[in-house]
């Protein structure tokens, strides 16, 4: 799996999970989130060569097509596979609200 | 929806469905498929700017992060959303086989 256990341990040009810490205030200009101040969002990036973690039959076909026709602009892309939620605390007026934001943290990647 | 009805009708630099016909023999070097000779596989390509068909909360966060921090290399990618199968005819010896290959045709795209 193209997850932290594999990707953060290996130097990898191909599609892999990349570390990304987002500070809500500094990076997004959000002041309304009280806790946490930021989080490990991570992201997916890297090349998708032939059979590198292909997600579907179509992405397999596309990576083969791209290998045989290197001038082609049609190639699979490295995107998130497994995501996890993030729980945040914010206030509406003086009332604290706890919200679970779905699909906020990328845990693994795929070529799609 | 970033499907043929929208994307093939509009000139679109952003993430959209692109037409791609794949000839099995010429483009993939496959001689074993008897019918069809090729098919409209299509593919997804284009930029994923702020709020353009964002698939998850993470891709929304990433597109905002990328907008506010344009020097960042972390940005969402244009990939397939809905896929359809393709039915093929091939032979094992002289025995005809009909097979439905899943997820072979891209029908719409998303920024993920």
């Amino acid at each position: 799996a193209l997850d932290a256990a594999y990707c953060f341990r290996n130097v990898q040009d191909n599609c892999c999970l990349r570390p990304l810490y987002i500070d809500f205030k500094r990076d997004l200009g959000w002041k309304w989130i009280h806790e946490p101040k930021g989080y490990n969002a991570n992201f997916c990036a890297g090349a998708c060569p032939y059979l590198w973690s292909s997600d579907t039959q179509h992405s397999r076909v596309l990576s083969l097509y791209n290998t045989i026709n290197p001038e082609a602009s049609a190639s699979p892309c490295c995107v998130s596979q497994d995501l996890e939620p993030l729980t945040i605390l914010y206030y509406i007026g003086k009332t604290p609200k706890i919200e679970q934001l779905s699909n906020m943290i990328v845990k693994s990647c795929k070529c799609s | 929806a970033l499907d043929a009805a929208y994307c093939f009708r509009n000139v679109q630099d952003n993430c959209c469905l692109r037409p791609l016909y794949i000839d099995f023999k010429r483009d993939l070097g496959w001689k074993w498929i008897h019918e069809p000779k090729g098919y409209n596989a299509n593919f997804c390509a284009g930029a994923c700017p702020y709020l353009w068909s964002s698939d998850t909360q993470h891709s929304r966060v990433l597109s905002l992060y990328n907008t506010i921090n344009p020097e960042a290399s972390a940005s969402p990618c244009c990939v397939s959303q809905d896929l359809e199968p393709l039915t093929i005819l091939y032979y094992i010896g002289k025995t005809p086989k009909i097979e439905q290959l899943s997820n072979m045709i891209v029908k719409s795209c998303k920024c993920s």
């Epitope: 997004l28 200009g29 959000w30 309304w32 919200e99 | 709020l51 909360q57 929304r60 966060v61």
Partner: nanobody
């Protein structure tokens, strides 16, 4: 009921100025990232400028130095001051409100035409 109402569009000569407003109702305005988008005839909708809930701003390269985005929380209103207008600025300008906790909202648009 959420409403975003744009105003301030119109016909202006090249080099002229306009100030667009987007009045929001039915939302907790201070939590929303607000953006101006535009769509020229036969072209895709594109981001012109954004101001986050905390006041961070960003502009499309084509409008940097000419347009200024701002927000007034007390009035639940966002503005776009457009100076040195060019013919390529012509299009329908849409207001967008986005907060990750809910969905995002769009206004109906206001027409800006730059012509002599």
């Amino acid at each position: 009921q959420v409403q975003l109402v744009e105003s301030g569009g119109g016909l202006v000569q090249p080099g002229g100025s306009l100030r667009l407003s987007c009045a929001a109702s039915g939302i907790s305005f201070s939590y929303y990232d607000m953006g101006w988008f535009r769509q020229a005839p036969g072209k895709q909708r594109e981001l012109v400028a954004i101001v986050t809930s905390g006041g961070r701003t960003n502009y499309a390269d084509s409008v940097k130095g000419r347009f200024t985005i701002s927000r007034e929380t007390a009035k639940s209103t966002m503005y776009l001051q457009m100076n040195s207008l060019k013919s390529e600025d012509t299009g329908v300008y849409y207001c967008n409100a986005h907060w990750i906790v809910t969905t995002d909202y769009w206004g109906q648009g206001t027409q800006v035409t730059v012509a002599s």
